[in-house]
Each structure stands twice: as structure tokens, then as C-alpha cells.
């Protein structure tokens, strides 16, 4: 166990041209606060994936009012550290997201309004117990300077906070089987502390806080004997003594969710569904009110005037979750038609259309002929984003300005043969097709399999295109 600590040093305009506008004004004074989200490993996960290592909100900073005409300075910051406690081992590699939020203090209906000013993210290696690491991150025209460290909470020590140390009971040496705790040579490595209540007779642990059962015993604290009449659980190896399947510890055994949260197993771990007023990986963060700004991504907080009453986050479009913390991937519904590229901008969906298509969802096939002229008696044919001219006999090219072979453009459909005729283009249709350009199958379910001349038609006859 331990604590990740984040110290914000400054938030203000970055170097270079294009200084950002001050987020506050005389008419709308505001103050800043920060949110940090930590995830284990060097994950490339999206910003909305769970903060599995933990998250924290800062206090609100001092109220700031812009001085007219003055450049945006570094903005006044909240006091103190942001602290993210972690219960298990420190992973050594982690990903972070630090969000800078603005709380507007004008006379909005329903209280203050929150909006996200900047979000920075990164992936770092960090050993617990080491010195403060300094960092600078830029988000658009803003620059954030901060330091961070991970420290173990006694009695845990080490780069991952997994070793436990106790002060020496005797001045000269540690107890039997226990080594000195480097670098704290005046302390001794302590025996592992299993999960509180773990049966000393039937349970054991290899990691702090766990409780693994000896054969024949089960339950979160290894206090329940496995009987042959209740061989129901498929989890775990077969017991030699009872012939039963002995359940191994599952991620939800003992319900790791605090404050009445309900636990559900996921493929890799577990997930807590927290009651209102609680959040965090294990529903351990409590007493949240609207004053704490629990609604992210511009969500509006309603209710929750005191720690005992619930709050509700009304999420803006594109976000969901009890704290508006999850971004809705609206592009997964493939709303853009005709091969358009979907862009989820948060506040709106955009479709970037392929040439020849338009509309909010690329649903309109453009009439590319509008305002186009084809020379020498040609007619304009739309399609594919570039107008084409269907040229009169003897002309070709994009605008029918060039003399051309009238059959070069393959004007006869469905394998019809083209002939340049003195009075116009002629298509000799394949059996089973008709029309000036053989574009109509006589029997579409099997045109080419029909007899060459169905009754009432002579599809092989040339159809003159005048």
C-alpha cells in the first residue's frame, strides 16, 4: 500500500506565439481545479477507460478575475498535493491523465458551471520511495508544470511497496527467518500480513492482504469446510480428500467493494458498481457532494447539497456513466454512409465524406452536373464526385471537346457490342438484354441463360442510340 502524490507547480500559457485567452473574465470570474487519473502499466488506453490505480480531485484554487488588456498569467492554483492512495503493490510503470478544470462563478442557474480547459497524458516508469520527478506537459497553448512521486505507507517498503518492515525488537538482530530491511537497516522484514480474519489454521498468503485456502476449506477467510454434498463450483482443482472441486479465490470473494458496492467479475479482474455518493475502484471514496465537482466532462451536478444526500450527474452529449466519466464511442455505430470517415469531436459527430457525397452523414450523392457544361451536344452524367460527360457521336474527353471513337467509353452495358454508325452509336445486345445501350436484362434472374430470342423480343437486334 502507498500513496501517489502530485504537486502542480504552474498552469499558464506555454512559450511561443498564440497565447491562450484567459479562462476567466471580470464578468465571469473563475477558479481552477485539477483531476488526476492513474492506470497501471504503460497502457495506450483511451482517456475514458477506468482509472484502475485510482483518481483524485484537487481543492478549488483561489478565485481569479482577468485584468483587461493584461496577458494571461500563470493562473492561481489550489493549495496542497493531489494524493491517490493505492492499496496493492505499486506497479512501477503507470499512465497518467491530468485534467485542468475551470469552475465559472457567474450567476448560472443551478450553481457553478464546469468545463475542461486542458488534458495532458503520459506514460512513465517510477519506483516507489524515490525522489520527486519533475515534468512539463503542453496541451494546446497551455503548459502544465508538475512533480510527482510514489511513496509507501508503513509498514510497506521497497520499490513496489510489497515488503513489510517493523522496528527491531532487539538491537542486534532480526527474528528467526527475517532479514534486515534495506535501506532501513534498523528495521526488520515482517512476516506477511494476510487478509484480516484469514483463518490461521486453514488459510495462508503469499501476498499481503490475500487469503488462500488449504485443501478442504473455502470461503473468503477459509473458514468454510468443503462438503461432498455441495460440489457445485467449477473453480479450482479437484480435492483429493473429498473428490470435490475446491473453489480457488475469485476476484469477488469477500466482496472487495466498500460502502455497499456490488462486485461483478470481469475477464481480468472485478468491477464495483457503487451506490450514489461513492466512487473509486472499490467504492472507497465517499461523502461526495456537488461541491466536490464529481461530474466530469462538463456534466451538470444536481442535488447532493450535503454528504448524506445523493447527487446526479447530467451528462453532455457524448458522455455517460454515473460521473460522466465514460466517452460514448458513437463512431462504433458507423453512422457515416458511403464510406465516410467518422470523427467524434465530443460535442458533436462529424462525417468526412468521400468525393461525390455530402450531407451530415454523407447520405447525399452529389449531383456533380450542377453548373457544368458538356460541349458538342454532350450530356452531363453525375457520379463519384467528378462530373462526366456522355458525349455525342464522334466526341470525347472530359467536356466532349475532343474528337473520339464513340465506342471507346464502352457505352454498351452487359457485354453488348458497340458499332460506330453513320447515324449514331449502335449497341448489339447480348442475348437476354435490351435497351438503347443493353442496360435492361430481359429476365434479371438469369438473363444470359435464356434462349437467344425470347418470344416477342429479338434481343440480338441492334438498338440504335440516336
Amino acid at each position: 500500500a502507498g500513496v501517489f502524490e502530485l504537486q502542480i507547480h504552474s498552469f499558464g500559457p506555454g512559450p511561443g506565439p498564440g497565447a491562450p485567452r484567459s479562462p476567466c473574465s471580470a464578468r465571469l470570474p473563475c477558479r481552477l481545479f485539477f483531476r488526476v487519473c492513474l492506470k497501471p502499466g504503460l497502457s495506450e488506453e483511451a482517456a475514458e477507460s477506468p482509472c484502475a490505480l485510482g483518481a483524485a480531485l484537487s481543492a478549488r484554487g483561489p478565485v481569479y478575475t482577468e485584468q483587461p488588456g493584461a496577458p494571461a498569467p500563470d493562473l492561481p492554483l489550489p493549495d496542497g498535493l493531489l494524493q491517490v492512495p493505492f492499496r496493492d503493490a505499486w506497479p512501477g510503470t503507470f499512465s497518467f491523465i491530468i485534467e485542468t478544470w475551470r469552475e465559472e462563478l457567474g450567476d448560472q442557474i443551478g450553481g457553478p458551471a464546469w468545463s475542461l480547459l486542458a488534458r495532458v497524458a503520459g506514460r512513465r516508469r517510477l519506483a516507489a520511495g524515490g525522489p520527486w520527478a519533475r515534468d512539463i506537459q503542453r496541451a494546446g497553448a497551455w503548459e502544465l508544470r508538475f512533480s510527482y512521486r510514489a511513496r509507501c505507507e508503513p509498514p510497506a517498503v521497497g520499490t513496489a511497496c510489497t515488503r513489510l518492515c517493523r522496528p527491531r525488537s532487539a538491537p542486534s538482530r532480526c527474528g528467526p527467518g527475517l532479514r534486515p530491511c534495506a535501506p532501513l537497516e534498523d528495521e526488520c522484514e515482517a512476516p506477511l500480513v494476510c487478509r484480516a480474519g484469514c483463518s490461521p489454521e486453514h488459510g495462508f498468503c503469499e501476498q499481503p492482504g490475500e487469503c488462500r485456502c488449504l485443501e478442504g476449506w473455502t470461503g473468503p477467510l477459509c473458514t468454510v469446510p468443503v462438503s461432498t454434498s455441495s460440489c457445485l463450483s467449477p473453480r479450482g482443482p479437484s480435492s483429493a480428500t473429498t473428490g470435490c472441486l475446491v473453489p480457488g479465490p475469485g476476484p469477488c470473494d469477500g466482496n472487495p467493494c466498500a460502502n455497499g458496492g456490488s462486485c461483478s467479475e470481469t475477464p481480468r479482474s472485478f468491477e464495483c458498481t457503487c451506490p450514489r455518493g461513492f466512487y473509486g475502484l472499490r467504492c472507497e471514496v465517499s461523502g461526495v457532494t456537488c461541491a466536490d465537482g464529481p461530474c466530469f466532462n462538463g456534466g451538470l451536478c444536481v442535488g447532493g447539497a450535503d454528504p448524506d444526500s445523493a447527487y446526479i450527474c447530467h451528462c453532455p452529449p457524448g458522455f455517460q456513466g454515473s460521473n460522466c466519466e465514460k466517452r460514448v464511442d458513437r463512431c462504433s455505430l458507423q453512422p457515416c454512409r458511403n464510406g465516410g470517415l467518422c470523427l467524434d469531436l465530443g460535442h458533436a459527430l462529424r462525417c468526412r465524406c468521400r468525393a461525390g457525397f455530402a450531407g451530415p452523414r454523407c447520405e447525399h450523392d452529389l449531383d456533380d452536373c450542377a453548373g457544368r457544361a458538356c460541349a458538342n451536344g454532350g450530356t452531363c452524367v453525375e457520379g463519384g464526385g467528378a462530373h462526366r460527360c456522355s458525349c455525342a457521336l464522334g466526341f470525347g474527353g472530359r467536356d466532349c471537346r475532343e474528337r473520339a471513337d464513340p465506342c471507346a467509353a464502352r457505352p454498351c452495358a452487359h457485354g453488348g457490342r458497340c458499332y460506330a454508325h453513320f447515324s449514331g452509336l449502335v449497341c448489339a445486345c447480348a442475348p437476354g438484354y435490351m435497351g438503347a445501350r443493353c442496360e435492361f436484362p430481359v429476365h434479371p434472374d438469369g438473363a444470359s441463360a435464356l434462349p437467344a430470342a425470347p418470344p416477342g423480343l429479338r434481343p440480338g437486334d441492334p438498338q440504335r442510340y440516336l
Epitope: 453525375e382 463519384g384 452495358a413 442496360e439 442510340y465
Partner: nanobody, 117 residues
């Protein structure tokens, strides 16, 4: 993507008249070759009448002089005016489009025409 919606089908007595409409979206009908097909129960779908992109028309012999295919560019629709209807004209009538730029074919869902006394 061209989409076609037929309307105007129904029950009519022998010798009566009916006009079928086909509304197109996604492309201008003036740039498409359009046609009407029909499929009677137990039979193959067959061409009835077609109108090419240049306006020239084609009909099967059994409907010549009775059916007329036409196009209204302003309404982006194609019509089949059917006169002197006979019992053998009973079928589901389908609208068809052939797009020259992509050489693709498109079909409507069909509308039922029943000629019966």
C-alpha cells in the same frame, strides 16, 4: 447509394388503368437508365419497359401500345402508365435503375398489381 420506392399498385378490373410511380433518391433520374419489371406468381421476373439515360424507350411486345414509361426529372421519379389491363398483367411490379458511372443496378421493394373482376 440509389434508393427506389414504388407506389400506385392495387386492385383494378380488366380493361382498367393504373399508374405506377417510382421515386428515386441518392441520384438524379436523368442520369440513370430506369425500367419497370414484373414477376407473376411462379414465374421469372421479366422486363416490362425501360427508359435510357438519353430518354429512348424500350417495351416488351406484350405491353406495346398499352403501357407507357416516362420520367419527371423535377420530381426525380419514373412512371408506368398502364392502360387496357389484362388478368395476365397481375404481378409484383419492381422499379429498376442502372447507374452508368458505377455500372451498378438497383431495385425497389415492389408494388402489387392485381387485375381481376
Amino acid at each position: 447509394e440509389v434508393q427506389l420506392v414504388e407506389s400506385g399498385g392495387g386492385l383494378v378490373q380488366p380493361g382498367g388503368s393504373l399508374t405506377l410511380s417510382c421515386a428515386a433518391s441518392g441520384s438524379s433520374v436523368s442520369n440513370l437508365s430506369m425500367a419497370w419489371y414484373r414477376q407473376a406468381p411462379g414465374k421469372k421476373r421479366e422486363l416490362v419497359a425501360g427508359i435510357s439515360a438519353d430518354g429512348s424507350t424500350a417495351y416488351i411486345d406484350s405491353v406495346k401500345g398499352r403501357f407507357t414509361i416516362s420520367r419527371d426529372n423535377a420530381k426525380n421519379s419514373v412512371y408506368l402508365q398502364m392502360n387496357s389491363l389484362r388478368a395476365e398483367d397481375t404481378a409484383v411490379y419492381y422499379c429498376y435503375a442502372y447507374r452508368w458511372t458505377t455500372r451498378r443496378t438497383y431495385w425497389g421493394q415492389g408494388t402489387l398489381v392485381t387485375v381481376s373482376s
